[in-house]
């Protein structure tokens, strides 16, 4: 029968950044197709990506319903052109994913410095509050909305003329730092979730420097 050529999916891997969440697996299909199911620990299975020849499935719409839940997915393998066919045990071959808890495991995306404004010897640096695909009351929540004070930002800043860095932290999206008058500074930020034990940090933002378009300078 056609089922003898069907192989189970393997290397099921969650790829998730700022809650945009995709399940990936192997192998590339040869004469077979896949369907994915996702469930919370206590919930019912929901099917997604029906009879696909892809080896990935976007599950964002499901996990954003409750990012603090723990999810499990499974990938079913069917013979191409004969999706009603089942394996020797009377059901299609499938493989389970690792468990995935979005709130604890989604990677923090690279942050962006939205603006900086100098007033005398103080600079206010603002980090863009990135929109996620998590919804509440029909509106998309920002990263800060979702994580609240669990999310902090670390600012690295240095004089354009030197390499010696300083750093500051905030549990909002704004920094107010002291600078030397008449000096230009460069800035980079990193997102951190201190309560995590893995995936705690984002990559660093692109560097922004004073004297470029993004900032504003006011001499008081």
């Amino acid at each position: 029968s056609g089922t003898t050529n069907t192989v189970a999916a393997y290397n099921l891997t969650w790829k998730s950044t700022n809650f945009k969440t995709i399940l990936e697996w192997e192998p590339k299909p040869v004469n077979q197709v896949y369907t994915v199911q996702i469930s919370t620990k206590s919930g019912d299975w929901k099917s997604k990506c029906f009879y696909t020849t892809d080896t990935e499935c976007d599950l964002t719409d499901e996990i954003v319903k409750d990012v603090k839940q723990t999810y499990l997915a499974r990938v079913f393998s069917y013979p191409a052109g004969n999706v009603e066919s089942t394996g020797s045990a009377g059901e299609p071959l499938y493989e389970n994913s690792p468990e995935f808890t979005p709130y604890l495991e989604t990677n923090l995306g690279q942050p962006t410095i939205q603006s900086f404004e100098q007033v005398g010897t103080k600079v206010n640096v603002t980090v863009e509050d990135e929109r996620t695909l998590v919804r509440r009351n029909n509106t998309f929540l920002s990263l800060r909305d979702v994580f609240g004070k669990d999310l902090i930002y670390t600012l690295y800043y240095w004089k354009s003329s030197s390499s010696g860095k300083k750093t500051a932290k905030t549990n909002t999206n704004e920094f107010l730092i002291d600078v030397d008058k008449g000096e230009n500074y460069c800035f980079s930020v990193q997102a951190v979730i201190p309560s995590r034990t893995v995936n705690r940090k984002s990559t660093d933002s692109p560097v922004e420097c004073m004297g470029q378009e993004k900032g504003e300078f006011r001499e008081i």
Epitope: I152, K165, T167, A168, K169, Q190, P194, T203
Partner: antibody
Framework: EIQLQQSGPELVKPGASVQVSCKTS????????VYWVRQSHGKSLEWIGY????????IYDQNFKGKATLTVDKSSTTAFMHLNSLTSDDSAVYFC??????????WGQGTTLTVSS | DIQMTQSPASQSASLGESVTITCLAS??????LAWYQQKPGKSPQLLIY???NLADGVPSRFSGSGSGTKFSFKISSLQAEDFVNYYC?????????FGAGTKLELK
């Protein structure tokens, strides 16, 4: 079990250099900064600087720029502090510690450095 | 740089009493403050983080309060093992300065 194991005591001559190591285990090395702190005999704690193993960024206290150099070896999950041009004022206990952003939650046992001719 | 002024430098107290140590920051640090205990010949041990949060495994007789520039650390019902050194540290901006320390002595 989370551990930070520092290298043993050092007795060196003035003008020499020394390297102190801090071997970490029991946690994801690149997820936490490693801080270095100095304590002279009977004195308070002085922050030397830190290194972020994730991106290699180092931050130093102004008093230790040019004196201390912080590095890591990700493959062995070890942090290093190199101290140069040593004088008797550098005689102290040096600690490494894990930074959880809000505090230093695990510390090495300390490395005693004695600078004497 | 942010200066941390810790007081008192030393304090005598009896078993079962309560003591309070204060740390003043030279500028606002929100709640970016930690408290440590250090026993003779040992490494510091984290007691309180984010000004008010008790670290794992730390007895509930230790507590922290404050935000902005004024912070307090309290030990209620002192035990024999509490008569050691205590330090505050601001972790808001570099350099991440420590207070000068408080030596708690048995009366």
């Amino acid at each position: 079990e989370i551990q930070l194991q520092q290298s043993g005591p050092e007795l060196v001559k003035p003008g020499a250099s020394v390297q102190v190591s801090c071997k970490t285990s029991g946690y994801s090395f690149t997820d936490y900064n490693v801080y270095w702190v100095r304590q002279s005999h009977g004195k308070s704690l002085e922050w030397i600087g830190y290194i972020d193993p994730y991106n290699g960024i180092t931050i130093y206290d102004q008093n230790f720029k040019g004196k201390a150099t912080l590095t890591v070896d990700k493959s062995s999950t070890t942090a290093f502090m190199h101290l140069n041009s040593l004088t008797s004022d550098d005689s102290a206990v040096y600690f490494c510690a894990r930074d959880v952003t809000t505090a230093l939650d695990f510390w090495g046992q300390g490395t005693t450095l004695t600078v004497s001719s | 740089d942010i200066q941390m002024t810790q007081s008192p430098a030393s304090q005598s107290a009896s078993l079962g009493e309560s003591v309070t140590i204060t740390c003043l920051a030279s500028q606002t640090i929100d709640t970016w403050l930690a408290w440590y205990q250090q026993k003779p010949g040992k490494s510091p041990q984290l007691l309180i983080y984010a000004a008010t949060n008790l670290a794992d495994g730390v007895p509930s007789r230790f507590s922290g309060s404050g935000s902005g520039t004024k912070f307090s650390f309290k030990i209620s019902s002192l035990q024999a093992e509490d008569f050691v050194n205590y330090y505050c540290q601001q972790v808001y901006s570099s350099p991440f300065t420590f207070g000068a320390g408080t030596k708690l002595e048995l009366k």
